[in-house]
């Protein structure tokens, strides 16, 4: 009986460990500033790091600029987007800016894209100041299915702060779907 | 056999409970405004409450102004920082302000400090308005090792809102490191 | 013994599944713009969706404009509030605005209300720009007891962005109370 009990304990520890790790996908992706689009309109950001510095990914996939869900579940999604301008970068085309982020979900099965979260601000970045900065943070709890894709759209991408501590997004699984 | 089964069940419940609680350190620290530095430069905030009001800590340590990790894992870190100024407080030295927060990680083993997250905004707080307010929120998912320390740096600390609902930071463990 | 072991495994899987789901209440509530109060003063927002679009709730209750906790635990709470104004909506009563959010907790047993988190900004929305936008995000980790209620207060509710991706709040349980 003792041997059986040990076997039960062992298999349970094994199962608990395995299920726990399998049940918790996550990603933290940081901006890759080598390929930021020009323009001031809303664009999808496709270049992100997933394996350097603070960037990491597990049980999710990063492909074609999108974070792909591999495991059904409820996830907490977040994004932090920083914009900055220094007068040495040149004159802004307009001092009235819409600095926005949109966190979108795309379903391959039903080809459609929907905005899960948005944030931002209109700003007046006048020439009276040599430096301007603004950050946006959004976060929320969403049901995601395997195969669904998360992407980030921003306005004025050329104003993005390229630091890994400034412009990033991520997700972590909190619980299974019943 | 029944006795053995009960023993297995009992030990398992015990183990599950124990491992679950041990696996989930957390902290929510609120600003201690009795000791906020003056000046407008970037400073590390060292005075935080950990055991009054909304402030709490478990399986983490607060020491010398830093939140110390006791258990390896992936944590969600967050900070909310509020700045405010009322004309009754006197005139601002400058109306052009950089209101910023930096969440930093320090490793004792390799004495180095790195910024995990930053946020904020440049603001023009003109004398035309009697009251000014601005809040920053940042959050992200990071791998932390036992002994590493989390601290908060801000610009213009004398403008911090001292309320516990306004200026705080925290962390909670989401999962183990594989 | 094998039959007993299977029974132990079976009951354990059942228990683990059940306890896991019971242990993780959550809610993501999106603004119901059909009933937003007018005025610029601070008001409690009572109309939220809990079962359409991104809105969802499990093991928590939404009643009388409040999110009610059904299960003791430590929860991560968050809110995202967007304000906007277009010149076609008419002239603002004042160009100097306080755009604020307050996440409050009410205890029925001891009839009292406390602010857990606040955020926002004073803004100068001048007539020089045809469109204005601003978003606030707050989040934090709190101990909540069964029966306690979470509600959202904002200033200038008539300026709220009614989109489900813009104005929402939520919570998810992270761990039990020891």
């Amino acid at each position: 009986i003792r041997a059986e009990k040990a076997m039960v304990d062992g298999s349970w520890l094994d199962l608990a460990k395995r299920s726990k790790l399998e049940a918790q996908p996550f990603a933290h992706l940081t901006i890759n500033a080598t390929d930021i689009p020009s323009g001031s309109h809303k664009v999808s950001l496709s270049s992100w790091y997933h394996d350097r510095g603070w960037a990491k990914i597990s049980n999710m996939t990063f492909s074609n600029g999108k974070l792909i869900v591999n495991q059904d579940g409820f996830y907490y999604l977040y994004a932090n987007i920083c914009f900055r301008h220094h007068e040495t970068s040149g004159d802004l085309a307009t001092e009235y800016l819409q600095l926005m982020v949109y966190v979108t979900k795309t379903s391959i099965k039903i080809p459609s894209s929907h905005t899960l979260m948005k944030g931002g601000s209109t700003k007046y970045w006048s020439g009276n100041s040599e430096f301007h900065f603004y950050s946006i943070n959004v976060g929320g709890f969403f049901k995601l299915r395997s195969g669904e894709e998360i992407s980030i759209e921003v306005s004025n991408p050329s104003l993005l702060d390229p630091d890994q501590d400034a412009t990033y997004f991520g997700a972590f699984k909190v619980r299974d779907i019943d | 056999i029944r006795a053995e089964k009960a023993m297995v069940d009992g030990s398992w419940l015990d183990l599950a409970k124990r491992s679950k609680l041990e696996a989930q350190p957390f902290a929510h620290l609120t600003i201690n405004a009795t000791d906020i530095p003056s000046g407008s430069h970037k400073v590390s905030l060292s005075s935080w409450y950990h055991d009054r009001g909304w402030a709490k800590i478990s399986n983490m340590t607060f020491s010398n102004g830093k939140l110390i990790v006791n258990q390896d894992g992936f944590y969600y870190l967050y900070a909310n920082i509020c700045f405010r100024h009322h004309e009754t407080s006197g005139d601002l030295a400058t109306e052009y302000l950089q209101l910023m927060v930096y969440v930093t990680k320090t490793s004792i083993k390799i004495p180095s400090s790195h910024t995990l997250m930053k946020g904020g905004s440049t603001k023009y707080w003109s004398g035309n308005s009697e009251f000014h307010f601005y809040s920053i929120n940042v959050g992200g998912f990071f791998k932390l090792r036992s002994g590493e320390e989390i601290s908060i740096e801000v610009s213009n600390p004398s403008l911090l809102d001292p309320d516990q609902d306004a200026t705080y930071f925290g962390a909670f463990k989401v999962r183990d490191i594989d | 013994i094998r039959a007993e072991k299977a029974m132990v495994d079976g009951s354990w899987l059942d228990l683990a599944k059940r306890s896991k789901l019971e242990a993780q209440p959550f809610a993501h509530l999106t603004i119901n713009a059909t009933d937003i109060p007018s005025g610029s003063h601070k008001v409690s927002l009572s109309s939220w969706y809990h079962d359409r679009g991104w809105a969802k709730i499990s093991n928590m209750t939404f009643s009388n404009g409040k999110l009610i906790v059904n299960q003791d635990g430590f929860y991560y709470l968050y809110a995202n509030i967007c304000f906007r104004h277009h010149e076609t909506s008419g002239d603002l009563a004042t160009e100097y605005l306080q755009l604020m959010v307050y996440v409050t907790k009410t205890s029925i047993k001891i009839p009292s209300s406390h602010t857990l988190m606040k955020g926002g900004s004073t803004k100068y929305w001048s007539g020089n720009s045809e469109f204005h936008f601003y978003s606030i995000n707050v989040g934090g980790f709190f101990k909540l007891r069964s029966g306690e209620e979470i509600s959202i207060e904002v200033s200038n509710p008539s300026l709220l962005d009614p989109d489900q991706d813009a104005t929402y709040f939520g919570a998810f349980k992270v761990r039990d109370i020891d």
């Epitope: 309109h41 004159d91 085309a93 050329s158 | - | -």
Partner: antibody, heavy 122, light 107 residues
């Protein structure tokens, strides 16, 4: 593909008006500033006017200030140049051109129209 | 206003030659300088922006350099398709100024 198609040129008497149009396709027109540049017969290129992506900011060469007006309709992806009080020295081949950067001035003009001729003569 | 002076006005060269065109500003300027190629009956083509950045799709034989008051466009090995007129263009404080042009012709 990315292109700018111009129209509206012609022969006009001094003192009269003319409106040039530039229809954009293949890119997000509302995200970029737009220029008008001209080349008088046998001469070099001369910058005329620019408008920011949102239409808020407009700048003009001294030679046309007060007479020419640049505008845009982002819903129709079209740029305009309204030329009033035309003079003989305004005779030129007029080009519309897209700003390389939507956010900053100064990066140059990366897409050009085919040009349209304006002749001011009595 | 800042004046931009190109030299030479005309340049005779052969295929394979290394060609350098200079653009001088009347006072020290930022690096907001672009170079264009213009052929008869065609629209101008952007070659270089911000003094030294090569526009996408432009052959690598074209290069830009310089700062202060003197900027240069270099064609490392002249090709038959490169015979055209080249213009520098400077941006400063909401004003755009073109040089008078340099015509590169066959020797």
């Amino acid at each position: 593909q990315v292109q700018l198609v111009q129209s509206g040129g012609g022969v006009v008497q001094p003192g009269r008006s003319l409106r040039l149009s530039c229809a954009a396709s293949g890119f997000t027109f509302s995200g970029y500033g737009m220029h008008w540049v001209r080349q008088a017969p046998g001469m070099g290129l001369e910058w005329v006017a620019v408008i920011s992506y949102d239409g808020i900011n407009k700048y003009y060469a001294d030679s046309v200030k007060g007479r020419f007006t640049i505008s845009r309709d982002n819903s129709k992806n079209t740029l305009f140049l309204q030329m009033n009080s035309l003079r003989a020295e305004d005779t030129a081949l007029y080009y519309c051109a897209k700003c390389l950067s939507g956010t900053y001035w100064g990066y140059g003009m990366d897409v050009w129209g085919q040009g349209t001729t304006v002749t001011v003569s009595s | 206003a800042i004046q931009m002076t190109q030299s030479p006005s005309t340049l005779s060269a052969s295929v394979g030659d290394r060609v350098t065109i200079t653009c001088r500003a009347s006072q020290s300027i930022s690096s907001w300088l672009a170079w264009y190629q213009l052929k008869p009956g065609k629209a101008p083509k952007l070659l270089i922006y911000k003094a030294s950045s090569l526009e996408s799709g432009v052959p690598s034989r074209f290069g830009g350099s310089g700062s202060g008051t003197e900027f240069t466009l270099t064609i490392s090995s002249l090709q038959p398709d490169d015979f055209a007129t080249y213009y520098c263009q400077h941006y400063n404080s909401y004003s755009w100024t073109f040089g008078q042009g340099t015509k590169v012709e066959i020797k």
